[in-house]
């Protein structure tokens, strides 16, 4: 039969031969012949492949370095890589999740819309008329002013979208 | 910071069973494989075989397939080796060395060791 | 599995002088490690992934290697690097040591 040009899914292509990949987790150590299957063996400690293929190393997994602010989120295994995340209060700079920023603060007059996970930067949003934010944060949202009407008090200074109003007791009328 | 902590040393008759413990402190030992090596007297090391705490999932050297057994509670972050039908080759100092993926260094830290003496 | 063999078994060395250890293993490994142990104590890692030096390590000390064959080299030998070190690989299991290399001082 004529020697194949192209091989099935799992397969490579080698000396006019398909021989099978090796599944995720196992390193090629002798492509197939005629008389003989491929032979693949486990990669070692701290190494993975996640593919079915013909690599002749495993990788190594990753470090997560505490230096850039990383930490484990899953170790390593023959068939995956490490899977970093950040340290409280930081967030990934990339999606591989190489290095980590601080959390950014919303700046007075602007609260937290979403607050920040280990892979998302704090989302900020403008206060809206009707609220302030008096402080720098990274979980705070924005407060309503208070209601002064409420306290059975007035406003005596209007509030902004950074002070909340201030309120003050009612002017009597003399009599 | 992290570290090892192993049980103390046992004296124990041929035929019997003995149950070594190997504490970690300073991680979480599911993010780590924990390691078992031999030392007999003034001889090398030896790998026995190691666990995945996240799942039991265990390996050993052939060699001690049926010798020994490496169990972990991680409610208390500590592994076990147990070691069955013991015999004077089962006399050496026992280590316990995690491969901790928060460290740079695989192996960098290890158990003081714990010795095991078989004799009648 | 794949077999370490270490040479020489013993060595010893003058305080200055520089030392190689070298590792053979039966089958190609991707990397090695070194630990280096005295009397009474547990090991320490010394050279991880072929030739990076573990924490606190001197920088006299140096490693190389690929494949089948790998070496631990002390560019200039001082008292305290008298020691028994072993070469060990995580490429394939079950895990496998070198019968250690017993450095001496002269």
């Known amino acids: 039969p004529e020697p194949p040009t192209a091989c099935r899914e799992k397969q490579y292509l080698i000396n006019s031969q398909c021989c099978s990949l090796c599944q995720p987790g196992q390193k090629l150590v002798s492509d197939c012949t005629e008389f003989t299957e491929t032979e693949c063996l486990p990669c070692g400690e701290s190494e993975f492949l996640d593919t079915w293929n013909r690599e002749t190393h495993c990788h190594q997994h990753k470090y997560c370095d505490p230096n850039l602010g990383l930490r484990v989120q899953q170790k390593g295994t023959s068939e995956t890589d490490t899977i970093c995340t950040c340290e409280e209060g930081w967030h990934c700079t990339s999606e591989a999740c190489e290095s980590c920023v601080l959390h950014r603060s919303c700046s007075p007059g602007f609260g937290v819309k979403q607050i920040a996970t280990g892979v998302s930067d704090t989302i900020c949003e403008p206060c809206p008329v009707g609220f302030f934010s008096n402080v720098s944060s990274a979980f705070e949202k924005c407060h309503p002013w208070t209601s002064c009407e409420t306290k059975d008090l007035v406003v005596q200074q209007a509030g902004t979208n950074k002070t909340d109003v201030v309120c003050g007791p009612q002017d009597r009328l003399r009599a | 910071e992290v570290h090892v902590k192993q049980s103390g040393a046992e004296l124990v008759k041929p035929g019997a069973s003995v149950k070594l413990s190997c504490t970690a402190s300073g991680f979480n030992i599911k993010d780590a494989y924990m390691h078992w090596v031999k030392q007999r007297p003034e001889q090398g090391l030896e790998w026995i075989g190691r666990?995945?705490?996240?799942?039991?999932?265990?390996k050993y050297d052939p060699k001690f397939q049926g010798k020994a057994s490496i169990t972990t509670d991680t409610s208390s972050n500590t592994a076990y080796l147990q070691l069955s039908s013991l015999t004077s080759e089962d006399t050496a100092v026992y280590y316990c060395?995690?491969?901790?993926?928060?460290?740079?260094?695989?192996?960098?830290?290890w158990g003081q060791g714990t010795t095991v003496t078989v004799s009648s | 599995d794949i077999v370490l063999t270490q040479s020489p078994a013993i060595m010893s060395a003058s305080p200055g002088e520089k030392v190689s250890i070298t590792c053979s293993a039966s089958s190609s490994v991707s990397y090695m490690h070194w630990f280096q142990q005295k009397p009474g104590t547990s090991p320490k890692l010394w050279i991880y992934s072929t030739s990076n030096l573990a924490s606190g390590v001197p920088a006299r000390f140096s490693g190389s290697g690929s494949g089948t064959s790998y070496s631990l080299t002390i560019s200039r030998m001082e008292a305290d690097d008298a020691a028994t070190y072993y070469c060990q690989q995580g490429s394939s299991y079950p895990l496998t040591f070198g019968a250690g290399t017993k450095l001496e001082l002269k």
């Open positions: 666990i995945d705490p996240a799942n039991g999932n265990t």
């Open positions: 060395t995690p491969n901790y993926y928060g460290s740079r260094y695989p192996f960098a830290y």
